[in-house]
Amino acid sequence: RAVPGGSSPAWTQCQQLSQKLCTLAWSAHPLVGHMDLREEGDEETTNDVPHIQCGDGCDPQGLRDNSQFCLQRIHQGLIFYEKLLGSDIFTGEPSLLPDSPVGQLHASLLGLSQLLQPEGHHWETQQIPSLSPSQPWQRLLLRFKILRSLQAFVAVAARVFAHGAATLSP
């Protein structure tokens, strides 16, 4: 079973959307605030971001055997980042620059997560962040850290979907 209900995901669609996510995540990275980062020290808020690891079944063999595990892991990560991008880290001050693609990035995360989990099907969503409000002076650094880890996450997800589209599509 690949997704809840036993059907395979639309690998090609997922591949296209995950590639778009990669582009958006990279283009969003420098466009997250009003000024350069300065005295803001290290923050712990991004320590618990989800990573795709060896045991998650996202290797070619794991995807062949049962892509469910890997896709669930990717889905959890997408939801995690979607919540972060909707938090006051991004919706609060400093306002995003007018040409920031963070809004598009947010919508695309939601779109891909919905492709992986069609309506009526439910995976457990672990690791959803319950964030306490962030101080405005912390937010620029947090945005940079979140987008940097999101870049890494979507890069792996894009490779998974590229492999799936090439070898697992019906």
């Epitope: 909707g86 919706t91 001050e93 306002s95 405005p136």
Partner: antibody, heavy 115, light 107 residues
Framework: EVQLQQSGPELVKPGASVKMSCKAS????????MHWVKQKPGQGLEWIGY????????KYNEKFKGKATLTSDKSSSTAYMELSSLTSEDSAVYYC????????WGQGTLVTVSA | DIVMTQSPATLSVTPGDRVSLSCRAS??????LHWYQQRSHESPRLLIK???QSISGIPSRFSGSGSGSDFTLTINSVEPEDVGVYYC?????????FGSGTKLEIK
């Protein structure tokens, strides 16, 4: 064009509650936090708190915890503030404002607490 | 809480004058300082954000400077419509706090 339209003036009795609204238009409501600010007649500005309409997360000034409750309705792009157990000290103009570093404020709602 | 102290409390000026309004924070707020103008019976209007950044639609005679804990709003050539109260605001950390205001009057 971004607009924040606040509800009309309220005359309320001591001990009662009042709920005012701030209807947003011209932008995606969930993009941005909404602040609420109090201004007593002839006095300065005081921050009450903010709501993030995307996830209904709130942050309050400790001084207003238990006095003000911030909510929002995504379907109508409206933010609300309810003030409870009103006293004469709550007589003021209340403003909503979208993010400090953007030039968008509502026109204010005058609340008068009087027996 | 960060206390914002504005001076002078009142400023009486002649049209064409160059005036400076001062704002001091009780601790460093980097450049997270915003300036507002409030005319009688109107909502506050954002004049300057992040200490020195201009706002679209605000006349160029308004400028801001400073960083850390000392900030200045300068009006290069005062116009009669500039009368009102000017507030500085800590946008750095919770709770957000405003100065008590400087009232600008025209002689």
């Amino acid at each position: 064009e971004v607009q924040l339209q606040q509800s009309g003036p309220e005359l309320v009795k001591p001990g009662a509650s009042v709920k005012m609204s701030c209807k947003a238009s011209g932008y995606t409501f969930t993009c941005c936090i909404m602040h609420w600010v109090k201004q007593k007649p002839g006095q300065g500005l005081e921050w009450i708190g903010y709501i993030n309409p995307y996830n209904d997360g709130t942050k309050y000034n400790e001084k207003f915890k238990g006095k003000a409750t911030l909510t929002s309705d995504k379907s109508s792009s409206t933010a609300y503030m309810e003030l409870s157990s009103l006293t004469s000290e709550d007589s003021a103009v209340y403003y909503c404002a979208r993010r400090w570093d953007e030039a968008y404020w509502g026109q204010g709602t005058l609340v008068t607490v009087s027996a | 809480d960060i206390v914002m102290t504005q001076s002078p409390a009142t400023l009486s000026v002649t049209p064409g004058d160059r005036v400076s309004l001062s704002c001091r924070a009780s601790q460093s707020i980097s450049d997270y300082l915003h300036w507002y103008q409030q005319r009688s019976h109107e909502s506050p209007r954002l004049l300057i954000k992040y200490a020195s950044q201009s706002i679209s639609g605000i006349p160029s005679r308004f400028s801001g400077s400073g960083s850390g804990s000392d900030f200045t709003l300068t009006i290069n050539s005062v116009e009669p419509e500039d009368v009102g109260v000017y507030y500085c605001q800590n946008g750095h950390s919770f709770p957000f706090t405003f100065g008590s205001g400087t009232k600008l009057e025209i002689k």
